[in-house]
Interface confidence: low
């Protein structure tokens, strides 16, 4: 069971300081942006991180949403990352959900965050290069210290 608590507005970056944004095709991508670029591209660069109370505490349970014309929420259904047109629900009556991730700080690096899927244990949000695009994907953690699964989260509130 997950019960919604408060939400915050955040900018999410990978460890090479590229900013996460949602493009016109609703794809989550990373790009180099100056602070002014980041502001100019809002709301596509501003993510709503909603925190949830977890009946089985396993870290901070969160959803990640973005509001452009409508609110879309990040999902890892079938281990494929996509934004689905939906509001983060007030309650989720399950111990797992494709839209719930556990946000945890990296041991020894309090400012670096990882997001583990509640549906797929050991799978994390990650940045991966595909041709010329830097995509947000779901990736199984396969090595200690993999920086592709680490992010910084900057509160904009």
């Amino acid at each position: 069971y997950f019960g919604k608590l408060e939400s915050k507005l955040s900018v999410i970056r990978n460890l090479n300081d590229q900013v996460l944004f949602i493009d016109q095709g609703n794809r989550p991508l990373f790009e180099d942006m100056t602070d002014s670029d980041c502001r100019d591209n809002a709301p596509r660069t501003i993510f709503i991180i909603s925190m949830y109370k977890d009946s089985q505490p396993r870290g901070m349970a969160v959803t990640i949403s973005v509001k452009c014309e409508k609110i879309s929420t990040l999902s890892c259904e079938n281990k494929i990352i996509s934004f689905k047109e939906m509001n983060p629900p007030d309650n989720i009556k399950d111990t797992k959900s494709d839209i719930i991730f556990f946000q945890r700080s990296v041991p020894g690096h309090d400012n670096k965050m990882q997001f583990e899927s509640s549906s797929y244990e050991g799978y994390f949000l990650a940045c991966e290069k595909e041709r010329d695009l830097f995509k947000l994907i779901l990736k199984k953690e396969d090595e200690l210290g993999d920086r592709s699964i680490m992010f910084t989260v900057q509160n904009e509130d």
């Epitope: 460890l15 090479n16 990650a126 991966e128 290069k129 990736k139």
Partner: antibody
Framework: QVQLQESGPGLVKPSETLSLTCTVS??????????WSWIRQPPGKGLEWIGS???????YYNPSLKGRVTISGDTSKNQFSLKLSSVTAADTAVYYC?????????????????WGRGTLVTVSS | DIQMTQSPSTLSASVGDRVTITCRAS??????LAWYQQKPGKAPKVLIY???TLESGVPSRFSGSGSGTEFTLTISSLQPDDFATYYC?????????FGQGTKLEIK
């Protein structure tokens, strides 16, 4: 074409702080896409990675030197610098600055593609 | 830290020879390995990265192979300019570490 040039004193006394600067020309350290690194090589020996700086200010250090090493950047001068405190004779080496292509996820390329000529620093009283 | 061990430490060869240098990692590093050439008094120069990708401008007589813990650098036909010291370097996990070097000398 990017070029790197190290500068700083060639002689440092034991227990003092070694300070070197790397001046980058032909490219900007604030542009992103690269780490800016320091590597050293004791006379007649192999290479040792000291640490790297990303344009955002993030730093990564070799744990063998952690606590003694600081790498910082000055984007206005297009320079990055190395400070190594409490030096001993074991820190005598040729110090190189180098550029490291940044990596993402599966496409990691942490090698050193552009190097400075190197500068010999001797630690002696 | 991941230890990188090169063999041989010294290799004597003649112009035109095919030579192979081996680098072993103390644990699996997938393909995250680079090779460098260094001449006396000069900075190292990257030849190969990601185990087998030839750096731009490097002659095609240089090639790299391997994955996991064992890697090789091969020079198909030695040229006079190739006599130098060669280093491998892993980039699988920080701290990035180098092999101790292989000195390639004229027989």
């Amino acid at each position: 074409q990017v070029q790197l040039q190290e500068s700083g004193p060639g002689l440092v006394k034991p227990s003092e702080t070694l300070s070197l600067t790397c001046t980058v020309s032909g490219g900007s350290i604030s542009a992103g896409g690269y780490y800016w690194s320091w590597i050293r090589q004791p006379p007649g020996k192999g290479l040792e990675w000291i640490g790297s700086l990303y344009y955002s200010g993030s730093t990564y250090y070799n744990p063998s030197l952690k606590g003694r090493v600081t790498i910082s950047g000055d984007t206005s001068k297009n320079q990055f610098s190395l400070k190594l405190s409490s030096v001993t004779a074991a820190d005598t080496a040729v110090y190189y600055c180098a550029r490291t292509p940044a990596y993402f996820g599966q496409d990691r390329t942490d090698f050193f593609d552009v190097w400075g000529r190197g500068t010999l620093v001797t630690v002696s009283s | 830290d991941i230890q990188m061990t090169q063999s041989p430490s010294t290799l004597s060869a003649s112009v035109g020879d095919r030579v192979t240098i081996t680098c072993r990692a103390s644990q699996g590093i997938s393909s995250w390995l680079a090779w460098y050439q260094q001449k006396p008094g000069k900075a190292p120069k990257v030849l190969i990265y990601k185990a087998s990708t030839l750096e731009s401008g490097v002659p095609s007589r240089f090639s790299g192979s391997g994955s996991g813990t064992e890697f090789t650098l091969t020079i198909s036909s030695l040229q006079p300019d190739d006599f130098a010291t060669y280093y491998c370097q892993q980039s699988h996990h920080p701290p990035w570490t180098f092999g101790q070097g292989t000195k390639l000398e004229i027989k």
